[in-house]
């Protein structure tokens, strides 16, 4: 099939005292090969500081996955979710407050 770029959605949730968990979800993409990782100050975080979900079919012939990491509250702006798919990339910052935002990466 043809390439379908991911929808990327970044959310934040309260973790332990002084920390938040930021989660980056990519959905509705094809083919299934994707890079999804958190970057701090422009550089990818090490694998052991991130948690990944499996790349799973979402029932529409496309796929979904996620990556999460725990960060200090107040440091959110230093972090960006980096997505790479089919030779294209996009970057997705952490929203302020408790809001969330959808980004659609267009190839």
């Amino acid at each position: 099939g043809s390439t379908v770029p991911p929808m990327v959605n970044v959310t934040r949730s309260e973790a332990s005292e002084g920390n938040i968990t930021v989660t980056c979800r990519a959905s509705s993409f094809y083919p299934r090969n994707i890079i999804l990782t958190w970057r701090q100050d422009g550089v990818s975080l090490s694998h052991d500081t991130q948690q990944w979900g499996d790349v799973l079919p979402d029932g529409n012939g496309t796929y979904q996955t996620w990556v999460a990491t725990r960060i200090c509250r107040g440091e959110e702006q230093r972090f960006t979710c980096y997505m790479e798919h089919s030779g294209n990339h996009s970057t997705h910052p952490v929203p302020s407050g408790n809001s969330h935002h959808h980004h659609h990466h267009h190839h």
């Epitope: 422009g42 972090f79 790479e84 030779g87 990339h89 910052p93 929203p95 302020s96 980004h103």
Partner: antibody, heavy 117, light 107 residues
Framework: EVQLVQSGAEVKKPGSSVKVSCKAS????????IEWVRQAPGQGLEWIGA????????NYNEKFKDRATLTADKSTNTAYMELSSLRSEDTAVYFC??????????WGQGTLVTVSS | DIQMTQSPSSLSASVGDRVTITCRAS??????LAWYQQKPGKSPKLLVY???TLADGVPSRFSGSGSGTDYTLTISSLQPEDFATYFC?????????FGQGTKVEIK
């Protein structure tokens, strides 16, 4: 010291192409995205796109998607921006910049591209 | 695309004056805003990022503030070397967009 050094000024004919280079030094080239921005004479700044020098993956402004090609050579720590089908409105200074998280922290000195018949 | 409306487009001021430049985004950019100073024939120089964080080496007379859609750059006491053009830029979503610039001239 982080440095981005760009190639020299170019004069091009309408319909031709130009390739501007941006040589990085003072940091790990493949770790950071390189962004490209242009500034027409007396005008504001316009984002062209970005490249991950490590993988070659790109992100283009839709306005430039059909005419701009971003590449990078890891062996020489150099990023390139090629713009095709040049027209007079493409006369501008072209800048490369390093993406540090969520802002551009270092910029090249700029390359003036003049499109004239 | 997010539009960045910067005002004023130019201003005349004297050394020692307090100068305020504003930037309004067409949508919430979650404080992902940078301010740059540019002098003729030079590349932009980063002054402020994340709306209010001063870049390394930038004098404390510069300050940034704002959230949501409205942002301000303030120069508390204008110095001779501050006469230049100032731009804002949003980093919330691509295409990254810039304000049209504010030229600060000598009165």
């Amino acid at each position: 010291e982080v440095q981005l050094v760009q190639s020299g000024a170019e004069v091009k004919k309408p319909g031709s192409s130009v390739k501007v280079s941006c040589k990085a030094s003072g940091y790990a080239f493949t770790n950071y995205l390189i962004e490209w921005v242009r500034q027409a004479p007396g005008q504001g700044l316009e984002w062209i796109g970005a490249i991950n020098p490590g993988s070659g993956a790109t992100n283009y402004n839709e306005k430039f998607k059909d005419r701009a090609t971003l590449t990078a050579d890891k062996s020489t720590n150099t990023a390139y921006m090629e713009l095709s089908s040049l027209r007079s409105e493409d006369t501008a200074v072209y800048f490369c910049a390093r993406f540090l998280g969520n802002y551009f922290d270092n910029w090249g000195q700029g390359t003036l591209v003049t499109v004239s018949s | 695309d997010i539009q960045m409306t910067q005002s004023p487009s130019s201003l005349s001021a004297s050394v020692g004056d307090r100068v305020t430049i504003t930037c309004r985004a067409s949508g919430n950019i979650h404080s992902y805003l940078a301010w740059y100073q540019q002098k003729p024939g030079k590349s932009p120089k980063l002054l402020v990022y994340y709306a209010e964080t001063l870049a390394d080496g930038v004098p404390s007379r510069f300050s940034g503030s704002g959230s949501g859609t409205d942002y301000t750059l303030t120069i508390s006491s204008l110095q001779p070397e501050d006469f230049a053009t100032y731009f804002c830029q949003q980093f919330w979503t691509t295409p990254y967009t810039f304000g049209q610039g504010t030229k600060v001239e000598i009165k």
